[in-house]
């Protein structure tokens, strides 16, 4: 009866350069328990080589010379006594491409090369990229361990060298970036930057790399309020904004953070559980009223913390003037001027373009001022008769603008013409 030698191994296997592959294999050979028990030796050879002379690519026979180019990279895995001939190939090289055959030997009775079941190995260019592993999300200020590994690679062959590059790594010393692992303490400015792990096998031309974009979670560090695209100045978490009464106001609150913070506006200085007047970063007031003078708060709420800024809104108005109006009274010529402005304006009277300051020492004129509600009133009393035609002006001004009015007093006329002349500062 013919001796039975059988081998189960896949016909072909493909592996990328620099990576590893395990080729499962099992075999059978004729063996009788009453035979003597010489050791069982198995071998993997390059196809086309004669077992008696060739160096093996892998064997369990300590007396057989192994090809230097496969030493340590081609290994028998599993128990040959259990007829396991599985072959592990590590750090695959292009020159490993080819066919291999398996051989079994046990004493003088069992010697056989399984030439009918050859293994075809094809080594292709490396396209596999390393994986960069870390616990997400990355949190600003919290040290995180990152590791770089190549799927399908193993310990066989020369060691792998690593290099890490990226803006987030600038403070690290070069030695740290040559390990497969590194500890990174990300900063907010590292969010969205690239981190690259490059792997190279020592002495080989095989290089592969993976780049990841860092997703750094960070609480808002600053809040900026924009009006018409221009950032307002902020001092000690407070911003001051003067607004013209009646004007429309649109403010945008921005607090860079990741993930984006929830922005909301509140009236005044709110308690933590206050109800916002806007649930977005935009505050819109169609017509600013003086009643809205005071404050608004923009709050940026984030899982990692919150930040808020107080906006001190001061409502201003240009001076509005009524008058002057003049009439003859017992004391003399009595002129009145009414005005309204925020902040409260200053006022002066002019006679023939000459300012009338305070009260005259000679008693030729007298100025009185009073206020009621948003309006302020000033009166001018001129003693004595008019020697000629006279022009009386009153002018009100604040830091935002001025307005003046004048009246021309004609000698011998009882009806006095008036006109209001607004004047900008």
């Amino acid at each position: 009866e013919k001796p039975v030698y059988e081998l189960q191994v896949q016909k072909s296997v493909t592996v990328q350069e620099g990576l590893c592959v395990l080729v499962p294999c099992s075999f059978s050979y004729p063996w009788r328990s009453w035979y003597s028990s010489p050791p069982l030796y198995v071998y993997w050879f390059r196809d086309g080589e004669i077992p008696y002379y060739a160096e093996v690519v892998a064997t369990n026979n300590p007396d057989r010379r192994v090809k230097p180019e496969t030493q340590g990279r081609f290994r028998l895995l599993g128990d040959v006594q259990k007829k396991n001939c599985s072959l592990s190939i590590g750090d695959a090289r292009m020159e490993d491409t080819g066919s291999y055959f398996f051989r079994v030997e046990r004493g003088r009775d069992v010697k056989y090369s399984y030439q009918q079941n050859k293994l075809n190995l094809e080594v292709t260019a490396l396209i596999e990229k390393p994986d960069i592993h870390f616990l997400e999300p990355l949190e600003s200020g919290r040290p995180t361990r990152l590791s770089c590994s190549l799927p399908g690679s193993c310990e066989a062959g020369p060691p792998l060298t690593f290099s890490w590059t990226g803006n987030a790594l600038s403070p690290l010393d070069p030695e740290t970036t040559r390990s497969s692992e590194l500890t990174l303490t990300p900063r907010p400015e590292d969010h969205g930057t690239n981190l690259t792990c490059q792997m190279k096998r020592q002495g080989a031309q095989v290089t592969t790399e993976r780049t990841v974009q860092l997703n750094v979670s960070y609480a808002p560090q600053t809040i900026t309020i924009f009006r018409n695209g221009i950032a307002l100045e902020i001092l000690q978490n407070t911003s001051y904004l003067p607004v013209l009464e009646g004007q429309a106001l649109r403010l945008l609150c921005d607090a860079p953070s990741n993930p984006p913070a929830h922005l909301s506006w509140f009236q005044g200085s709110p308690a933590l559980n206050a109800t916002p007047i806007s649930n977005t970063g935009i505050l819109e007031l169609r017509r600013v009223r003086s009643a809205e003078e005071g404050g608004f708060t923009c709050r940026a709420q984030h899982p990692l913390g919150f930040l808020q800024i107080f906006l001190n809104l001061s409502v201003y108005s240009l001076p509005q003037l009524l008058g002057p109006s003049c009439s003859w009274e017992a004391e003399g010529l009595h002129c009145r001027c009414s005005f309204r402005a925020r902040p409260a304006p200053s006022l002066c009277w002019r006679l023939e373009e000459k300012p009338l300051e305070g009260n005259s020492s000679q008693g030729s004129f007298k100025v009185n001022s009073s206020s009621a509600g948003p309006w302020a009133n000033s009166s001018l009393i001129l003693h004595g008769g008019l020697s000629s035609d006279l022009k009386v002006s009153c002018k009100a001004w604040n830091i935002y603008g001025s307005q003046s009015g004048s009246v021309l007093l004609l000698q011998g006329r009882s009806n006095l013409g008036t006109g209001v002349v607004p004047a900008a500062l």
Epitope: P3, Y52, Y53, E55, K111, Y112, S113, Q115
Partner: antibody, heavy 119, light 112 residues
Amino acid sequence: QVQLQQSGGGLVKPGTSVKLSCKASGYIFTEYIIHWVKQRSGQGLEWIGWFYPGIISIKYNEKFKDKATLTADKSSSTVYMELSRLTSEDSAVYFCAGHEGYDGAMDYWGQGTSVTVSS
Amino acid sequence: DVLMTQTPLSLPVSLGDQASISCRSSQSIVHSNGNTYLEWYLQKPGQSPKLLIYKVSNRFSGVPDRFSGSGSGTDFTLKISRVEAEDLGVYYCFQGSHVPWTFGGGTKLEIK
């Protein structure tokens, strides 16, 4: 028991060819390298070449490359050597020898077959 | 080709004597796999050669222990400690490390 049984040869005319055979038994045919060795009358031994059925590997001594052609028939476990364009120089006893194992030695020999080239 | 030179060409001995045959190769016969394939064969008249020693010093199965081989590099020796009548014949050294494989010219061991 390993045995190599040789046949063929005899008296042949110059310019013709002869095919010698070496039939193996007692082992797995693909596991032995079969060598052919020439010995002229009263002379030493000369290695002609080998045939390894395991991978159909053939190696020749350059001196015999144009003289000898080695082939095999696995089904009959036989290795052949054909000698062409025979001359009197080819008159000799030809041995086949089996070589198995890592010891590199020709451990089993056929009985030899004689070729006489004469008109 | 590797030239194998045997000395002496003829070695007359008395039965029971020690015999020594030398073989020198024209270059190292260490194979690329690390083995030295130096063998000794004995051919008796009208017979096929028989293997005695392989890989310089290993006796083939069934070969009496009075036969021993030694040497390295390019110089090798076959010794027969006590010659017996059945040992007579022509001894050939052989190298199987480099193609073409080559035999020595032979040493004829004969009775004095």
